[in-house]
């Protein structure tokens, strides 16, 4: 084959920032590192065909597909699209390549199919096909990993059917409480499926894939620590496995560990020991508890029993249907400009809930914090003290749970003011919501002191901005006051605005701000 | 620019099981058609595929090691990792990663970029 | 699963002569579905063909490749001393993929 141009074809991903249409070069989007799409010369083709790696991209993103040729000389080019001519405006970089960019924004379906690029140098004609086609979510799940005992060994496999295959990591750590928060040192990740090293504090698995990551902790009982005040409860669906894991570490190893429910012995079969000897000589023992498929019949009390230790037991509740518990009912809030102050929600949930908080429609993301009482508790304290209307949606397979939340800022009124040949209007945004008064500036009143009640229309709360209630007052020209400066005031129990306004003007002049306290 | 880096152990004793890691940059499996496979070379012999991965999560393995085999991917992290149970010192080899511009199974099955390579000893 | 032989297992020429290396399949291979790689001491093997005769990128015009079937080559038309090295043939387009076991080029 003749001496080719060297061609590189490549994939930018951006990150949207705005919800622009259309193909443009300049757009307002943060942009991920260039991916090569290995473009190479197809064989068998009639002419020079280029083709670079079919792309898959998710509905709504926004990509970039760019060509950069190494080739002497001017280049000229087309783009073709489902038989339509487009645009094409090569440039050059820095090592002097001919670059020619296709930038296709909010990918839809119309826009998915087969992108021609016909480019023309001084030596020679050549085509490059690129591919685009639209990813197909709808078929990706993430799956709560669960657990399962190795064949013919004393070890942990962590499963987790989800699509895309996930990747699975077991999360140790042997510390106690907040120090096995995820980022902290003393938490050791290990990206395999079969665990071997059972005695540790705290053992997690997760899975993760393009929808996110999930995680299982080993419900664990430990027979060193002190109970906690009530009594642990372990929730599972008919159907699911069940583990618990029973600890206890003892001077020697005479010491024996048993499960029992509800006073009966677990049958031999679901139950397995392990022992190892600790750094310092001491004896550990764990013992599982484990069933393969839930029925309603294993619902009870689980207790583990040592002959050296105080028992403990825990409340196994099989349900047929996954739940959220939490009081539904709305709240409102009334704070200072610069109190410290936190949404909370407190629930019971099983399987673990997804949440989000939402104001002014953004969404922030949502953590979620276990309490020793079974129940979990989400908070919000990144509002900014914005006053509005706060939404916590939690969701997980089985139920949706949705509570509302109104955020007051106490704070003196501020006015804004606009006037039309017919009527004043002014607004104000305080809380507590403003009461109004209107006043005319003459000769006879040059402080402005005179009242006016006529032609006053007061609208409360009449415009609800994501929950942020705003306060009007309009009124109405009359012969009586054309031509004068009035003003108008707002005030509640925090202070008074005022703004100033002439009536014959079509707008609010000049704004004199009268701050009265 | 694509590049790929092996890296995992240097020596491994027979019967254990065998994890290596790809590192890759430059392209992604999370939005174009592309695979990677592992290949090896024992000291003084000729290359041997053992196992490929797709961007669609289509996996397959040399039919010899197909038991002994596992491959994943997580293309947030532009890993790929196999592994190899039961390893004998006949496994002693140097293994590469390679990128293949497409699908095996059509005109883009072949590998156009390659790691340096990992030399891994299996002996007692 | 088809085998790959690679002939002469062992081809020692000169600076600027001709080598043409031979690559046999055991079946025929769909769309002539053959690549060819490089292999310097000490290094990773390196794309020179696919598609059995479509040069990769960066690849000087001496390497050629021509074949079809069975019976797949591997042309150097004037042997710069850089070309001395192991070169491997690969079938794909199904799997398994297969490399041949290679020919080493070496200076006469």
């Known amino acids: 084959n003749q001496d080719l141009p060297v061609i590189k074809c490549v994939l930018i991903n951006h990150k949207n920032n705005d919800s622009s249409v259309g193909k443009s070069s300049s757009y307002p989007m943060v942009s991920e590192s260039p991916e090569d799409l290995g473009c190479a010369l197809r064989p068998q083709s009639s002419g020079t065909v280029y083709e670079a790696a079919a792309v898959e991209v998710d509905v709504s993103a926004s990509i970039t597909l760019q060509v950069l040729v190494d080739a002497p000389g001017n280049i000229s080019c087309l783009w073709v699209f489902k038989h339509s001519s487009l645009n094409c405006q090569p440039h050059f970089d820095l090592q002097n390549r001919g670059v020619v960019s296709m930038v296709i924004l909010k990918m839809t379906e119309t826009q998915a199919g087969e992108y021609l690029l016909f480019i023309q140098s001084e030596a020679t004609n050549y085509t490059i096909l690129f591919t685009v086609s639209i990813r197909n979510t709808l078929l990706y799940t993430l799956r709560r990993p669960y657990f399962r005992k190795m064949e013919n060994q004393d070890a942990l496999v962590c499963i987790s059917e989800s699509v895309p295959e996930p990747i699975v990591e077991w999360v140790l750590c042997d510390s106690q409480g907040e120090s096995c928060k995820e980022e902290s040192p003393a938490v050791v990740k290990k990206e395999e499926k079969v665990l071997h090293e059972l005695f540790g504090t705290d053992i997690r698995c997760c899975a993760r894939n393009e929808l996110g990551r999930e995680c299982t902790r080993l419900f664990t009982i430990d027979l060193n620590q002190t109970p906690q005040t009530t009594l642990p409860q372990l929730f599972l669906k008919v159907g699911e496995p069940l583990w618990i894991r029973c600890k206890a570490v003892h001077v020697n190893h005479g010491f024996g560990l048993t499960w029992e429910l509800e006073n009966k012995a677990l049958e031999e079969g679901n139950y397995f020991e392990m022992s190892t000897y600790s750094t310092n000589r001491t004896m550990i023992r764990i013992l599982f508890a484990f069933v393969s498929s839930v029925a309603r019949n294993d619902t009870g009390y689980y207790t583990c029993s040592s002959s050296k230790h105080p028992s403990q037991s825990a409340l196994v509740t099989i349900v047929e249907k996954g739940f959220i518990n939490a009081t539904n009912s709305s709240e409102d809030y009334e704070i200072d400009q610069y109190e410290e102050f936190c949404f909370s929600v407190r629930f019971k949930a099983y399987p673990q809930i997804r949440c989000t908080w939402t104001f002014s429609r953004k969404s922030f993301p949502c953590e979620q914090k276990g309490l020793d009482n079974g129940y979990s508790i989400s908070k919000f304290c990144n509002h900014k003290h914005q006053p509005g209307e706060y939404i916590f949606h939690a969701e997980n397979d089985d139920a949706q749970f949705t509570k509302m939340f109104t955020l007051n800022i106490r704070r003196k009124p501020q006015v804004l003011a606009e006037a039309s040949a017919s009527q004043a209007s002014c607004f104000s945004d305080g809380y507590p919501l403003p009461s109004w008064t209107w006043k005319k500036c003459s000769d006879k009143s040059p402080n402005c002191t005179e009242e006016i009640t006529e032609g006053v229309w007061n609208r409360k709360a009449n415009r609800k901005v994501f929950g942020q209630w705003v306060s009007s007052s309009t009124l109405n020209m009359s012969e009586a006051i054309k031509g004068f400066l009035v003003k108008c005031c707002a005030y509640n129990s925090l202070g008074t605005s005022c703004e100033t306004i002439l009536l014959n003007s079509p707008g609010p002049f000049p704004f004199i701000q009268d701050n009265i306290s | 620019q694509v590049t790929l880096k092996e890296s995992g152990p240097t020596l491994v004793k027979p019967t254990e099981t065998l994890t290596l890691t790809c590192t890759f940059s430059?392209?992604?499996?999370?939005?174009?058609?592309?695979?990677v496979s592992w290949i090896r070379q024992p000291p003084g012999k000729a290359l041997e595929w053992l196992a490929h991965?797709?961007?669609?999560?289509?996996?397959s393995f040399s039919t010899a090691l197909e038991s002994r085999l596992t491959i994943s991917t997580d293309t947030s992290k532009s890993q790929m990792v196999l592994t190899m149970t039961n390893v004998d010192p006949v496994d002693t080899a140097t293994y590469y990663c390679?990128?293949?511009?497409?699908?095996?199974?059509?005109?883009?099955?072949?590998?156009?970029?390659w790691g340096q390579g990992t030399l891994v000893t299996v002996s007692s | 699963e088809i085998v790959m032989t690679q002939s002469p297992g062992t081809l020692s020429l000169s600076p600027g002569e001709r080598a043409t290396l031979s690559c046999r399949t055991s079946?025929?291979?769909?769309?002539?579905?053959i690549a060819w790689y490089q292999q310097r001491p000490g290094q990773a093997p390196r794309l020179l063909i696919y598609?059995?005769?479509t040069r990769a990128t960066g690849i000087p015009d001496r390497f050629s490749g021509s074949g079809s079937g069975t019976d797949f080559t591997l042309t150097i038309s004037r042997l710069e001393p850089e070309d001395f090295a192991v070169y491997y043939c690969q079938k794909y387009g199904s799997s398994p993929l297969t490399f041949g076991g290679g020919t080493k080029l070496e200076i006469k």
């Open positions: 390679a990128r293949m511009p497409g699908d095996s199974n059509t005109w883009r099955g072949f590998f156009d970029y």
């Open positions: 598609g059995t005769s």
């Open positions: 079946q025929t291979v769909t769309n002539s579905y």
């Open positions: 430059g392209f992604s499996l999370r939005y174009a058609r592309m695979g």
């Open positions: 991965i797709s961007s669609n999560d289509e996996k």
